[in-house]
């Protein structure tokens, strides 16, 4: 019978700067039922608030919906673990939504083999930004990265596409089936997960670039 061990807020992520979620790891188990609560205040304010939504993000999480998410404000948050023996507190975590954006993967990745008559053939791919991200407002600059590999190969070949939503690759092995994926990241923030793999069969008569 011990008080709970010290919890740790280990991750906060936002898909689009409009909402965000934080997750914590419980500390050691005191062998008793333990309640967790996340409290926060905005830097410069003294009023403490409790997590508005413990459900949406899954176990040991706190989700901040649109009405609780402010840009350009730092959130100071802490998790309290309590059982009948006492309470333990996490270290405070300072969160600025601008720097925790992890977008959803890009959408609608299409890949084609192009074989123009007058030039070398190439692989052409295009995609769309994730729907939650509104690029028109200028709030976001999204950067993209592509990776591809022959189906049975172990190593991926990675290409940085910058802000483009299309890309060409010239050096490919004829007759191979390739997996292609794309991911994105905001200028300040984290890479998204890779998009689902798109498969493309390279024709046997595809001419390698010299």
């Amino acid at each position: 019978q011990l008080p709970p061990g010290k919890p740790e807020i280990f991750k906060c992520r936002s898909p689009n700067k409009e909402t965000f979620t934080c997750w914590w790891r419980p500390g050691t188990d005191g062998g008793l039922p333990t309640n967790y609560s996340l409290t926060y205040h905005r830097e410069g304010e003294t009023l403490m608030h409790e997590c508005p939504d413990y459900i949406t993000g899954g176990p040991n999480s706190c989700h901040f919906g649109k009405q609780y998410t402010s840009m350009w404000r730092t959130y100071v948050m802490m998790v309290n673990a309590t059982n009948q023996m006492g309470s333990s507190f996490s270290d405070e975590l300072y969160v600025d939504v601008t720097y925790i954006v992890q977008p959803d993967p890009p959408l609608e990745l299409t890949v084609e083999v192009k074989q123009p008559e007058d030039r070398k053939p190439y692989l052409w791919m295009k995609w769309s930004p994730p729907t939650l991200i509104d690029l028109k407002t200028g709030w976001f600059t999204l950067l993209y990265e592509i990776r591809l590999k022959p189906e049975k190969a172990a190593e991926w070949e990675t290409h940085f596409a910058g802000q483009q939503t299309e890309f060409k690759i010239l050096s490919l092995h004829p007759g191979q089936k390739y997996l292609v994926q794309v991911r994105c990241k905001p200028d300040h923030g984290y890479w998204s997960a890779w998009s689902p793999a798109t498969f493309i069969q390279i024709p046997s008569d595809f001419i390698m670039n010299d």
Epitope: Q1, L2, P3, L32, M85
Partner: antibody, heavy 117, light 107 residues
Framework: QVQLVQSGAEVKKPGASVKVSCKAS????????ITWVRQAPGQGLEWMGW????????DYAQKFQDRVTMTTDTSTTTGYMEMRSLTSDDTAVYYC??????????WGQGTLVTVSS | DIQMTQSPSSLSASVGDRVTITCRAS??????LAWFQQKPGKAPKSLIY???SLQSGVPSKFSGGGSGTDFALTISSLQPEDFATYYC?????????FGQGTRLEIK
């Protein structure tokens, strides 16, 4: 009201085993556990270990690790402490205690275990 | 293991006196400290938990203080029923450990 009622005094021979019970009532047994503390004659209090009625977890003081077993039975709301290979140094009053709302807020009346040849 | 050192080991005082018993932990125990009173032939009784919080039903003449490694129990005005042995206990980590006790006697 909360009560912890322990089994009666025991006299044991060296090398024997003893099993002390602690019957709990008046609170939700399954959200706590039973801790065992002993006190040799004229000596201080010594924590022996505990058994969780919540998740079955047990923790023992190292000196008792090899010869003590603590259990809780939620169907009878009873905690048990069994000690094997008794010696005269184990002569003591054995107390059970629990956590209802606050740390160690309720105690049993104690069980005297005498080890003598 | 965390060692708990109580002082003094015995103390003589008169009815009406204010007395303080101290307890030092060998490392920081995050204020997870309890105080118990024990009378001869009786089970310990919890007085204080979390260094300074009074257990339900315990008179306010008992108070606890301190933090980190140094703690104290103060009895503000001794009554005949307060003469007993007092123990501190840390419950910050296993093994839970007690101080060696302070015997409070009538002068």
């Amino acid at each position: 009201q909360v009560q912890l009622v322990q089994s009666g005094a025991e006299v044991k021979k060296p090398g024997a085993s003893v099993k002390v019970s602690c019957k709990a009532s008046g609170y939700t047994f399954g959200t706590s556990g039973i801790t065992w503390v002993r006190q040799a004659p004229g000596q201080g209090l010594e924590w022996m270990g505990w058994s969780s009625a919540y998740n079955g977890k047990t923790d023992y003081a190292q000196k008792f690790q090899d010869r003590v077993t603590m259990t809780t039975d939620t169907s009878t709301t009873t905690g048990y402490m069994e000690m094997r290979s008794l010696t005269s140094d184990d002569t003591a009053v054995y107390y059970c205690t629990t956590v209802v709302r606050r740390p160690f807020d309720f105690w049993g009346q104690g069980t005297l275990v005498t080890v003598s040849s | 293991d965390i060692q708990m050192t109580q002082s003094p080991s015995s103390l003589s005082a008169s009815v009406g006196d204010r007395v303080t018993i101290t307890c030092r932990a060998s490392q920081d125990i995050n204020n997870f400290l309890a105080w118990f009173q024990q009378k001869p032939g009786k089970a310990p009784k919890s007085l204080i938990y979390a260094a300074s919080s009074l257990q339900s039903g315990v008179p306010s003449k008992f108070s606890g203080g301190g933090s980190g490694t140094d703690f104290a129990l103060t009895i503000s005005s001794l009554q005949p029923e307060d003469f007993a042995t007092y123990y501190c206990q840390q419950y910050s980590s296993y093994p839970i450990t007690f101080g060696q006790g302070t015997r409070l006697e009538i002068k």
